[in-house]
């Protein structure tokens, strides 16, 4: 699931999620992490992966709460 | 493991209503808490929720004039909704999870509610 | 957003009788689904999640099922204490609560 298109790159905040990832993606393929922006319809954490993918996931999932505190802790 | 909300009451048009979920039995270090609200013979409809490291998300509808926060330390969790309109009467719920069932929206913990009336 | 419509109000069952409550949403929740058992007064009290795993404490003869955009609520062996109002949420998608279904046991 990608984000909306930005004209300052691929991974700029302002970016918003309009739909989320269906998928557990697993911890190692993830290299970090923001929220989108707070005046985004919707709320997102988007994922950037080891191959430079952008993901949407929905905060409320338990996963994606976990995987945050890993990556603050770490 | 329980939480309750603090009084309602009656409001005017254009106030602010502030509600407090107090948590027992658990620490919101560990739970996410979810404000629901429903309107008088209507569905439940979701207001907003704060995580368990206290990051708030809130309902598209909601979000430019609701503020959640929470007090750890005191396991207390603050609804503000301001420009209260009569469209705004209903029992509101807190509900906590703590992710048990995969997703912190669904919730196992709720309030017994408070009735806020909004009315000149 | 996604839109959530269930069963119309009132739905009747005899005492041990089947009941059943569907739950159409507009667009595919891949299962992200709960249903919730609300009596007058009451807070809502979770059933099931993910469309068809039963909560902590429910009892069996709660069934939730379905796929895709369809989702069902069954529940058999009907008791007198299972007249309520059941409601499905989606948490897919924005959060989204259907109105609610009120069961009336004869």
């Known amino acids: 699931t990608k984000t909306e298109s930005s004209s300052r790159g691929p991974y700029h905040p302002s970016e918003c999620c309009f739909t989320y990832t269906t998928y557990k993606i697993p911890r190692q393929r993830i290299m970090d992490y923001y929220e989108t922006n707070s005046q985004c319809s919707k709320p997102g954490i988007v994922f950037i992966t080891k191959r430079g993918h952008s993901v949407c996931t929905n905060p409320s999932d338990k996963w994606v709460q976990d995987y945050i505190k890993d990556m603050k802790e770490n | 493991q329980s939480v309750k909300e603090s009084e309602g009451g009656l409001f005017k048009p254009a106030d602010t209503l502030t509600l407090t979920c107090t948590v027992s039995?658990?620490?919101?270090?560990?739970?996410?808490i979810n404000w629901v609200r429903q309107a008088p013979g209507e569905g439940l409809e979701y207001i907003g929720w704060?995580?368990?490291?206290?990051?708030?998300y809130y309902a598209s509808w909601a979000k430019s004039r609701s503020t959640i926060t929470r007090n750890a330390d005191e396991n207390t969790v603050t609804l503000k909704m301001t420009s209260l309109t009569a469209a705004d009467t209903a029992t509101y719920f807190c509900a906590g999870g703590d992710g048990s069932y995969s997703n912190y929206w669904v919730s196992d913990i709720w309030g017994q509610g408070t009735l806020v009336t909004v009315s000149s | 957003a996604v839109v959530l419509t269930q069963t119309a109000s009132p739905v009747s069952a005899p005492v041990g009788g089947t009941v059943t409550v569907k739950c159409q949403a507009s667009q595919t929740i891949n299962n992200r689904l709960a249903w919730y058992q609300q009596k007058q007064g009451q807070p809502p009290k979770l059933l099931i999640y993910e469309a068809s795993k039963l909560a902590s404490g429910v009892p069996s003869r709660f069934k939730g099922s379905g796929s895709g955009t369809e989702y069902t609520l069954t529940i058999r062996g009907v008791e007198c204490a299972d007249a309520a109002t059941y409601s499905c949420?989606?948490?897919?998608?924005?959060?989204?609560f259907g109105g609610g279904t009120e069961v009336v046991v004869k």
């Open positions: 949420q989606e948490y897919a998608d924005e959060n989204i």
């Open positions: 704060i995580s368990d490291v206290g990051t708030a």
């Open positions: 039995g658990f620490s919101l270090s560990s739970f996410a």
